[in-house]
């Protein structure tokens, strides 16, 4: 029977910067039963507090709501575990909610076969942005990324849109059909899931681009 | 304890390309962005890029976007830096430096340092 | 890109005084700023982040303060170990640059 090991505060999220859920590993837990508390304080401040909300998040985790959730303010956290035969600490992880952001999928994705008498044909796409997310503030700045591939493909084609919430793709087998899928990022934070596919069939008389 | 290990130094000719690698132990490696920073012989520090190794999600600063390619391997907890078409104002010690948590970009762990000598 | 400008280049202070370091940012960086310690043949080390704020482990001698473009760093009692350079380091926007540095060396 000994101490239990040290834990590791791995991993912070939130889906909009209004709340967010930091996750920890434990350590070994040296053959006894341990409990865990999550303690932070914010950058500037002296006074420690305890986790909030040590249920919403899952096992091993803790969440911050709305009323313990401020941007640009730093949150330096640690995990204590403890059992009989003593305690461990983890390392201080440094948490600035700004930079955690994981949005849901972008929405309302639309593909349709565009083909103008002028003009080569091509694929345009069309989606919103994820709605927690606020964009009129100037606080969020999303990017998507677009992938596509025939049905029986395997290989996925990766298109980056930037800020963009419209894409259009030129070079496509005719008489394909293609999955296609969207996914966002805020500009310091994390990919978004895949948005469920939507597929499209190319048209046999679709020419494809040189 | 967190480290981060580098490769050892390098002489390389003008023309040639040279790849740093920085091996992560001591925490999640996929949880902190990885920064990359030179220092050439008695000068200041100069940051090349980062790249975050959940995604391989990158960033480059400008002067070195079209030489500078920022990789990770997951499976090793390693990061690396190759840098292309070297040149002799490109001798340095290249240091790879972790974020020093999830927020901006301050640095609180860094490798030791590889020196990289570009000569004919 | 943003410049920072550190000064003095190099200063020249007794052990036990108080030294300060300053750094000016070539546009407006909010509290963005980080402050590190380098000593000959080993890499940096994070002192202050946030403009302000002490890093883990960083001795209370060690303070910075400013926003906006001044900022400074002060030592208020050196010890023999913190004869080295000083970089300050602005994370406001790309790309993250660093001053010049500072030297302090002993009186």
């Known amino acids: 029977q000994l101490p239990p090991g040290k834990p590791e505060i791995f991993k912070c999220r939130s889906p909009n910067k209004e709340t967010f859920t930091c996750w920890w590993r434990p350590g070994t837990d040296g053959g006894l039963p341990t409990n865990y508390s999550l303690t932070y304080h914010r950058e500037g401040e002296t006074l420690m507090h305890e986790c909030p909300d040590y249920i919403t998040g899952g096992p091993n985790s803790c969440h911050f709501g709305k009323q313990y959730t401020s941007m640009w303010r730093t949150y330096i956290m640690m995990v204590n575990a403890t059992n009989q035969m003593g305690s461990s600490f983890s390392d201080e992880l440094y948490v600035d909610v700004t930079y955690i952001v994981q949005p849901d999928p972008p929405l309302e994705l639309a593909v349709e076969v565009k083909q103008p008498e002028d003009r080569k044909p091509y694929l345009w796409i069309k989606w919103s942005p994820p709605t927690l997310i606020d964009l009129k503030t100037g606080w969020f700045t999303l990017l998507y990324e677009i992938r596509l591939k025939p049905e029986k493909a395997a290989e996925w084609e990766i298109h980056f849109a930037g800020q963009q919430t419209e894409f259009k793709i030129l070079s496509l087998h005719p008489g394909q059909k293609y999955l296609v899928q969207v996914r966002c990022k805020p500009d310091h934070g994390y990919w978004s899931a895949w948005s469920p596919a939507t597929f499209i069939q190319i048209p046999s008389d679709f020419t494809m681009n040189d | 304890e967190v480290q981060l290990v580098q490769s050892g130094a390098e002489v390389k000719k003008p023309g040639s390309s040279v790849k740093v690698s920085c091996k992560a132990s001591?925490?999640?490696?996929?949880?902190?962005?990885m920064h990359w920073v030179r220092q050439a012989p008695g000068q200041g520090l100069e940051w090349i890029g980062e790249?975050?190794?959940?995604?391989?999600?990158?960033n480059y600063n400008q002067k070195f976007k079209d030489r500078a390619t920022l990789t990770v391997d997951k499976s090793t907890s390693t990061a690396y830096m190759e840098l292309s078409s070297l040149r002799s104002e490109d001798t340095a010690v290249y240091y790879c430096?972790?974020?020093?948590?999830?927020?901006?970009?301050?640095?609180?762990?860094w490798g030791q340092g590889t020196l990289v000598t570009v000569s004919s | 890109e943003i410049v920072m400008t550190q000064s003095p280049a190099t200063l020249s202070v007794s052990p036990g005084e108080r030294a300060t370091l300053s750094c000016k940012a070539s546009?407006?960086?909010?509290?963005?700023v980080a402050w590190y310690q380098q000593k000959p043949g080993q890499a940096p080390r994070l002192l202050i982040y946030?403009?302000?704020n002490r890093y883990t482990g960083i001795p209370a001698r060690f303070s910075g303060s400013g926003s906006g473009t001044e900022f400074t760093l002060t030592i208020s009692s050196l010890q023999s170990e913190d004869f080295a350079v000083y970089y300050c380091?602005?994370?406001?926007?790309?790309?993250?640059?660093f001053g010049g540095g500072t030297k302090v060396e002993i009186k």
């Open positions: 430096a972790r974020n020093g948590g999830l927020g901006p970009a301050w640095f609180s762990y």
């Open positions: 001591g925490y999640t490696f996929t949880t902190y962005w």
């Open positions: 790249i975050d190794p959940s995604d391989s999600y990158s």
């Open positions: 546009q407006y960086v909010g509290t963005a």
């Open positions: 946030s403009a302000s």
């Open positions: 380091q602005q994370y406001s926007s790309y790309p993250w640059t």
